[in-house]
Amino acid sequence: LRPSRVHNSEENTMRALTLKDILNGTFSYKTFFPNWISGQEYLHQSADNNIVLYNIETGQSYTILSNRTMKSVNASNYGLSPDRQFVYLESDYSKLWRYSYTATYYIYDLSNGEFVRGNELPRPIQYLCWSPVGSKLAYVYQNNIYLKQRPGDPPFQITFNGRENKIFNGIPDWVYEEEMLATKYALWWSPNGKFLAYAEFNDTDIPVIAYSYYGDEQYPRTINIPYPKAGAKNPVVRIFIIDTTYPAYVGPQEVPVPAMIASSDYYFSWLTWVTDERVCLQWLKRVQNVSVLSICDFREDWQTWDCPKTQEHIEESRTGWAGGFFVSTPVFSYDAISYYKIFSDKDGYKHIHYIKDTVENAIQITSGKWEAINIFRVTQDSLFYSSNEFEEYPGRRNIYRISIGSYPPSKKCVTCHLRKERCQYYTASFSDYAKYYALVCYGPGIPISTLHDGRTDQEIKILEENKELENALKNIQLPKEEIKKLEVDEITLWYKMILPPQFDRSKKYPLLIQVYGGPCSQSVRSVFAVNWISYLASKEGMVIALVDGRGTAFQGDKLLYAVYRKLGVYEVEDQITAVRKFIEMGFIDEKRIAIWGWSYGGYVSSLALASGTGLFKCGIAVAPVSSWEYYASVYTERFMGLPTKDDNLEHYKNSTVMARAEYFRNVDYLLIHGTADDNVHFQNSAQIAKALVNAQVDFQAMWYSDQNHGLSGLSTNHLYTHMTHFLKQCFSLSD
């Protein structure tokens, strides 16, 4: 729980947060996610880096891998084979993009306590995983896929056409990694390890983004990434499946694409194995309002995969794009043909549906003016999911269980009343057959992770309660936080306000708006955080507000799809509307209002500053998008359509930051970007700067050499220190 407020007699011993506290991560919290290996066992890395096996039923634990072994190869990660014979140890981690990295892998034999010698794995490896049963290995090296029947065996090469920046096998290219799969891998074992499915991405015709990486050499390096911007040529994707028992027998077999998808540009969106001989693929038209789920079966006689039209399920949106941020994935039931899936109901709220034959005949499982967010697990008799139903707060997450074995199905909230004040935002992790599960509570109080019985929901033990953090916060004057809503013109604007510790409604405070505002995002969440804005409220006496306007998620399609094909309009309007309402509350100094945001938030903050309202004195944009023509095709076109004359080029042109250069004249603007941003290219800020210079508008700027979209490491400290100075100067606060 948040430490309770102390009375004046003790207030002298309390101190405000400092910027140093934030930059040092003094008040960071821990979570505990068990690495499940069976219904009742999990692995966990202990504080002293031993890998320990816990048996919930016996209460016993023992070390299966010592820290000495881990240290011998500088391992930072591990993975136990399902037959418990081997562990892979991962070292030499080298980050690539958001999810991808390369590493060196060593295989340790637990039976004899030695590393496997002979036929060692090549280095560096792009992805490696065990089969779901036994100890087969699949890995990707130099964009090709390899298979080992046993760790000590020589590898079998599955693909041969892999080429850097051209053909990717078993791993996604840049745009599929960031905007479609959200993983570092693009290969999937069948449940018993008989088959291996994989994607091949052909980037041959994709235009390349090139930027300088300055490094320490005499000449900078040029980084080249095939990166399709809006309207550009996209990757060509194909899905193959190979029999891993006899991989050389027939080789990889291509899975056919549904005809209605293949007729124009399309994407592959996900693959879900149902059984060893049934697989479900999801495809999406390039214009992302039509998605097709295709269930395919293995034909033993032909050794091919058959995807009958009768097993194609179409999901279409008439008011926006298909799905939320991504199209949801199915969770199959035990009959291996019917499944549960989240999609919009007739009232425009995302809910769980049960599909047995056709989508038209789907049975709606949840309903109401709230949204189902994730299906965690389906067992023979229960379905576990999360939603924001409880007490009508869209920024909460509770875990529910629906009994599907009985009729009518009964619903129980597993988490709603557990630690009601402390915990309102949960996720969960389930063991095999949901015999046990871990709950991870993210707030609003201090996070806590607990272990529960999957049948009774009884709490078995606390896995992590962040006692040290609780003690460390005892003498800190934390800001107050409140989550409320504004009703404006039939739109509900939820906001979070962070108030200085000694907040007094009769006084006037500077206001900082923190904005993200991207489609299907949510900023107003009941989670714990001690971060930069906590410091600004605690030490510098600012009021900070976050507002979820049109385009944001989990409040129905009307709000979500309001921004369809017109990004940069309503998101900005709603921030401005909220600021006006905050001023009406009487405690905001209207001469000291600022806005800041990062990425999409940098775009919104820039447009808000250039809105000509006179509301904002100053603002900051970190790594902003400045024109949707500069951003990735998969993301941009989902919400904006194509930048062509016969589609939506006009709004692409109207929604740029550059077009509003003149309007920055009356605000103080700080523009910040990393020069090695692979995601929102430095080009975006370069163009803003050019437009401001051409308009003879003064502004401040900071670049971070060789830094990507995250501005990590020492850059983080410099960034927040720099932004703090800028805001304090803007608000006339003494340094």
């Epitope: 069976s38 219904g39 016993q60 023992y62 010592s66 418990r84």
Partner: nanobody, 116 residues
Framework: QVQLQESGGGLVQSGGSLRLSCVAS????????MGWYRQAPGNKREWVAG???????NYADAVLGRFSIFRDNPKNTVYLQMNSLKPEDTAVYYC??????????WGQGTQVTVSS
Amino acid sequence: QVQLQESGGGLVQSGGSLRLSCVASGSISSINAMGWYRQAPGNKREWVAGITSGGSTNYADAVLGRFSIFRDNPKNTVYLQMNSLKPEDTAVYYCNTWPPSTFGSWGQGTQVTVSS
């Protein structure tokens, strides 16, 4: 620390059967998953079969369909039923937790010899 005692080994002809037993000095149900391992002369120790406390079983490819592992919790015993034995099954057989504990010790094992 639970002490483990293997028994039931012996000399058997190719195609024959043996049943190995492993008795735990502590309560076996208080131990998680149990496994059988073997070490042939000149080779490294390798895993043969495993059974979880819930009764789920798993086998090495080399013994799949020929060996079966089962447990009798009240008797604190884990068994390995070995059928259709082959000369290449000749080894010292050990039982231990599955996977074995880094800091645990191995028992004496029981010798299985399969003659052709």
